[in-house]
Amino acid sequence: KFSKQSWGLENEALIVRCPRQGKSSYIVDWYYSQTNKSIPTQERNRVFASGQLLKFLPAEVADSGIYTCIVRSPTFNRTGYANVTIYKKQPDCNVPDYLMYSTVSGSEKNSKIYCPTIDLYNWTAPLEWFKNCQALQGSRYKAHKSFLVIDNVMTDDAGDYTCKFIHNENGANYSVTATRSFTVKDEQGFSRFPVIRAPAHNETKEVEIGENTNLTCSACFGKGAQFLATVQWQLNGNKITDFSEPRIQQEEGQNQSFSNGLACVNTVLRIADVKEEDLLLRYDCLALNLHGLRRHTIRLSRKNPIDHQSTYC
C-alpha cells in the first residue's frame, strides 16, 4: 500500500514523492533501505531529501534501489517505500515498455496528452513535445501548460509522445523526459443534449430493508468519442462525496459503451444494507455535456411482503 514504483533515465533529474502522506508540517526522513544510511538534506549533494520529496539531480543507474521515507509527527512515525529504477539512455529512438507511463486515448474532440509526473518539478513553460523521437512542429500541435493538444486528430497521430522540460534547482538546470502512448479512436461523431436511458424520470424502485441494491444511471451523448460526457448520482441534491454515508457508494470510474454507435456512459450507485431513512432520499441521475444538464429522479419504496396466508379447510 505504501510502496510506489518510480523510474527515470541516467543524467536526467528524477524527483520522487514519499508514498506515505502526512500533514505538510511533518518532518520526513529518507534512508537507503539496504544500508539504512540517511540521505542528506543538503542541496549540494547529487541525491538529497527535501521534505516529502527525494531528488536525484541528476540520476545515475547506480541509484536504483528501494528508499525508505519515514514521516514523523510529534508523536508518530509512519513509513513508506519508493522503489526507484534508473535506466541507461537508449541509443536508438525506441522507448522500452518499462519506461512508459500510462496510455491515454483521444479522438477528434479530445486530444489532451498530459506530461506525466511534471507536477513534482520546478519547471517553466513551454514544454517540448516529441512523437516517436521527432520534435512536433506545426499549428496542429499546441503545448499548453502541462499538456499537449492536437487539433483535428487522425489515426496516424497515434504513437509514443515524449514531453521534455527543464527542472530548475537553485539556478542549475536539469533535463527531464517522460513518455506515454497515445491511441486514437477513429470515429466520426457528433454530440447532442444528453438522453438518460435509465432510470425513467420519477421512477420508483422497490427494495427490501437490510438488502443491498444498485441503481444504474445511464445516458447517451451522441456518436463517437465525446469531449465532455459525465453521469453521476446526487442524493437530495448533494454530491455523493459530500453525503458522508459509507454505505452508499458511487462506482469508481464510469463505463463507456458504444451501443449502436452511440456514446453512452453508466455509473452505478451501490447501497449496502438498505435502511428506512434511504427511502426518504431523492436520488438524482445527472447527465452532463457541453449542451447541458439532464436530471432524472428515482425514489426507493419498501417492497410489499408477499402474503403467505395458509388456507385451512
Partner: antibody
Amino acid sequence: EVQLLESGGGLVQPGGSLRLSCAASGFTFSIYDMIWVRQAPGKGLEWVSSIRGEGGGTYYADSVKGRFTISRDNSKNTLYLQMNSLRAEDTAVYYCARDPWSTEGSFFVLDYWGQGTLVTVSS
Amino acid sequence: EIVLTQSPATLSLSPGERATLSCRASQSVDDDLAWYQQKPGQAPRLLIYDASNRATGIPARFSGSGSGTDFTLTISSLEPEDFAVYYCQQYITAPLTFGQGTKVEIK
C-alpha cells in the same frame, strides 16, 4: 500537555436532548480531526462521529445519523455533540478523542482521549 | 462496514506469562490497525498503530504483528498493571470500527 475534558452528560428522558462539550488544550486544535466514541455500560467501544479539522467535513455512525450533530468552534478550542431524540440504547460514557494524523480522505488512530462523560437515557 | 473479531474473549494468565491476543478483520485493512488498552473506569490508551508500531511511552513488552486480515498483539511477559481489556481498531475506512475486546485477567 494535551488535555481533553468532556462535560454536559447527565440523566435525560427518552426523546430528550443533550449537548456534550469537549474542551481541548495543549495542542493546535484547529488542524486536528476530532472524534466522539461511546461505551455502553459493560460493553465495548463504538465510534459515534468524526469531524475534520479546518475543513469541517462530518461523519456519523448509522445508529446516530439524523439525531446527533457534531460541530466544533476552533476559536474556543471546543468540540460539541448535539444529541436529539435520545433513546435508552444511547446510554453510555461518551469520550472525545483526537486523530493526530488523518489527511483528507483518510483516518488514523486516537492518541488522546478525555475522561468521558456519562449520558443516561431513562424515564 | 468492516467487522473486527477478537479472540479469545477472556484470557486467564499469571504475571510473567506470555499473552497472545488475536484480531481478525472481515476484509483486508492493510496495516491500518491499532490496539488499545482499557482499565476499569479509565479511557482507552493507545498501544500500537499501523499494526506493529509502538506508540510513545509504551513498554517494549507490547508488540503487534500482522497485515491484511489477521493481527496479533503479544505481551511478552505480563506485569500486574497489564491486566485489562484490549481492543483492536481499524482505520482504513469509515466507519471506524473496534473489536469487541479481549479481557486479560489474573489466573
